[in-house]
Interface confidence: low
């Protein structure tokens, strides 16, 4: 399908002008290529009428132009002094007329209505309010005032000053007669319907002395605003319906093939399941205006959208509406990124979030979509640090890999973390994206001890076990803070032969702190990555305590939380109840080693990756 988009139907009246805007993907090639407006003939050929290269056909000379706006990816065709002959089928497009990078536009120019002299024309959108002004002379001040609608040759009474109201206008019309001295009465019609369209006659008095005034009421369906957005991107519909419906329920609906309108979201709590996790209705401002944000745009989201107000929260005739025609461009600048990321309970996820690469300095955010009521998205983390304290130690936003993508890591997953999350920046709002986190059955790949208690001044060694499939990945330990995760100095992993015969049970990357200080208390992450792309992480909390005074019962200087079927013995080692340890390496993986001896390398914190056979039980 062509990525060029414009208005499907344009209608106007003889003598008037039209302005037709066409959209195209703003790639470098498209921005500089020829733009055209052509008319389709009976043969199927499309004859150029005006182009961006300065060509104007003789038929359009002096009354038409084409202006390209390359920075917006749009061009506009203006045509003035329209005649009935201009009605027909046209194309706006890029490149060569026959190439197919175009959009079909139907133009209909109708004859203006033959109106009696002195007719006042009122042009109002459907659902809105019109005030018809009716002047009269002093002698008709005490006499009956009335408004008629002309239907063919007859006049049908709509309202009069004797309290008559035509049933078609019940509860939405009033006649106002001013105080003495003002020689004008007004008729106010609310919630205009398309059927209200037509010629009206104001009348004051009767007989040959009566005052009459013609009024032509043109009730228009709102011209849909064209909205051109990228696949996977985001759109915002701003809906301003006026103060008169400020306290009425609001909705956004999409017009279907039957020309009825299916509710997408409303303020009464209804939401189309197709938009689950990717829609927000921002609560309305005092003036009754509101906005709806939809992210993760799909091709099937294309169509005509209406926003409106009605106590039922859905479209009803005669209530104000606003319209948009949404086109979703498949030649998207927004890169593909997973819309679903799966993790296991206790494990982690690393989510890639796209942003406009031209806005590398923009603030980055991640929020959790909440579906209650109209939906909202509390921020969890931003590029300057953590926002929600309950995510301490398990959530971090990283600027890597950069150049249009940032990373969010969430670990210590539970089933409650399942849900929809939004990637945001304070820049280009069209780059908002949605990702769903699903928690599936399985075990975390990285294994670390439970919480660890370290002793001041001594050496702490924390193991992180990884499976063979990660042997080619870069392993790291980092210390978490609410502004990120600071990688700790890493030692070489040793000769590559060590990984050739990968023993599924023997891969360790160890963190050594020597000597332990008060500042070492906190969360540490063990993780794997490939270049700037992050994989799984596992978190461990290190608490720091004073050395026990002589005479007190001895407990291992650095102990991991005992698993449910283990007990910590006074000797500082674990006994696994009712289980024979057949392979000492299995125990070594779980052992947190404390050593008061000097560390050979002399560095305070180091990371070592080796097999447990190489590591043995000693601190490196």
């Amino acid at each position: 399908k062509s990525p060029v988009f414009g208005p499907q139907e344009v209608s106007s009246v003889e003598g008037n002008s039209v302005s037709i805007k066409c959209y195209y993907p703003p790639t470098s090639v498209n921005r500089h290529t020829r733009k055209y407006w052509c008319r389709k003939g009976a043969s199927g050929r499309c004859i150029t009428l005006v182009s961006s290269e300065g060509y104007v056909s003789s038929n359009y000379a002096g009354r038409a132009n084409l202006t390209n706006f390359p920075e917006n990816g749009t061009f506009v065709v203006n045509i003035a002094q329209l005649s009935r002959d201009d009605s027909g089928h046209y194309k706006c497009g890029l490149g060569i007329n026959s190439r197919g990078l175009s959009f079909d536009v139907s133009l209909e120019v109708s004859q203006g209505p033959e109106l009696p002299n002195g007719t006042e024309v009122y042009t109002v959108d459907v659902g809105r309010t019109v005030t018809i002004k009716c002047p009269f002379k002093t002698e008709n001040a005490p006499k009956t005032k009335a408004l008629y609608k002309k239907i063919g040759q007859t006049s049908v009474l709509v309202i009069d000053s004797r309290n008559y109201v035509n049933p078609n206008y019940k509860d939405r019309i009033r006649l106002r007669i001013p105080g003495t001295g003002q020689l004008i009465f007004t008729v106010v019609i609310d919630r205009l319907r398309l059927s209200d369209h037509g010629l009206y006659l104001c009348q004051a008095g009767d007989g040959s002395n009566r005052d009459e005034k013609n009024a032509d009421l043109q009730v228009l369906e709102p011209e849909p605003e064209l909205v051109y957005e990228d696949l996977r991107g985001s759109v915002t519909f701003h809906c301003a319906l006026g103060l008169e419906v400020a306290n009425v329920a609001k909705f956004l609906c999409r017009v279907n093939s039957r020309e009825t309108c299916d509710v997408v979201i409303n303020t009464l709590g209804k939401r189309d399941s197709a938009f689950e996790g990717r829609i927000l209705l921002n609560p309305q401002d005092k003036d009754g205006s509101f906005s709806v944000v939809i992210t993760g745009l799909r091709k099937e989201d294309e169509g005509r959208y209406l926003c409106g107000a009605h106590s039922d929260g859905q479209l009803q005739e005669g209530w104000p509406i606003q319209a948009w025609q949404l086109f979703v461009n498949e030649e998207s600048t927004i890169p593909r990124s997973p819309t679903v990321v799966k993790g296991v309970a206790g494990g982690s996820v690393a989510v890639l979030c796209p942003y406009n690469p031209k806005e590398s300095q923009s603030l980055k955010y991640w929020c959790l979509w909440e579906g209650a009521q109209n939906g909202r998205c509390p921020l969890l983390v931003e590029s300057q640090g953590l926002v929600q304290e309950q995510y301490e130690g398990r959530l971090s936003l990283l600027q890597e890999p950069g150049n249009g993508t940032f990373t969010v890591i969430l670990n210590q997953l539970t089933t409650q973390d399942a849900g929809f999350y939004w990637c945001l920046t304070n820049g280009d709002t069209r780059w908002r994206t949605t990702v769903e986190i699903k928690i599936i059955e399985g075990e975390p790949n990285l294994k670390v001890p439970g919480n660890v208690t370290a002793v001041l001044g001594e050496t702490l060694n924390i193991p992180c076990h990884f499976p063979c499939k990660f042997s080619s990945y870069e392993k790291y330990w980092c210390k978490w803070s609410n502004t990120g995760c600071q990688t700790l100095p890493s030692q070489d992993e040793g000769p590559s032969e060590a990984f050739v015969n990968c023993d599924e049970n023997s891969r360790l990357v160890s963190l050594t702190l020597n000597p332990v200080t008060r500042a070492d208390e906190g969360w540490y992450w063990c993780g794997v990555k490939q270049g700037h792309f992050y994989g799984e992480t596992a978190a461990v909390y290190v608490a720091v305590e004073e050395k026990k005074v002589a005479g007190s019962r001895y407990v291992s200087p650095a102990k991991a939380d005992a698993a449910p079927d283990e007990k910590v013995l006074d000797s500082g080692v674990r006994e696994i109840e009712n289980k024979a340890i057949q392979d000492p390496r299995l125990f070594a993986e779980e052992k947190v080693v404390a050593d008061t001896g000097d560390q050979a390398g002399g560095s305070r914190a180091s990371v070592d990756s080796s097999s447990s056979e190489e590591q043995g039980g000693s601190s490196k």
């Epitope: 921002n282 309305q284 509101f290 909202r376 998205c377 300057q384 304070n426």
Partner: nanobody, 124 residues
Framework: EVQLVESGGGLVQAGGSLRLSCAAS????????MGWFRQAPGKEREFVAR????????DYADSVKGRFTISRDNAKNTVYLQMNSLKPEDTAVYYC?????????????????WGQGTQVTVSS
């Protein structure tokens, strides 16, 4: 969590002006929607004004429109409420509030962080 401290309240004659300040600590507020609310004795806490994180969008209660102006200085981590043409009915405790919600408009329920309040008394 962000801590908010209001200052600038006091006693002023009707028609006078006051400028309230709300200083934030604990974290930067340049991503927070910030607002001012007030509570008169025996009444519910009511919305006065709010400003989005960039300062580009503001909103006011009808009762203060044209008289009060909300502004922010993200570099100083501070939000201000300039109150002109004060009336006796403006007498209340004024609270500063912050919201980390990504939302175009916030009610008092959406504000997670609150200051202790500063008393404004307008005498006739």
């Amino acid at each position: 969590e962000v801590q908010l401290v209001e200052s600038g309240g006091g006693l002023v004659q009707a028609g006078g002006s006051l400028r309230l300040s709300c200083a934030a600590s604990g974290r930067t507020i340049n991503t927070y929607v910030m607002g001012w609310f007030r509570q008169a004795p025996g009444k519910e806490r009511e919305f006065v004004a709010r400003i989005d994180w960039s300062g580009s969008s503001t909103d006011y209660a009808d009762s203060v429109k044209g008289r009060f102006t909300i502004s922010r200085d993200n570099a100083k981590n501070t939000v201000y409420l300039q109150m002109n043409s004060l009336k006796p009915e403006d007498t209340a405790v004024y609270y500063c509030a912050g919201s980390a919600y990504y939302s175009g408009y916030v009610t008092h329920r959406d504000f997670g962080s609150w200051g202790q309040g500063t008393q404004v008394t307008v005498s006739s």
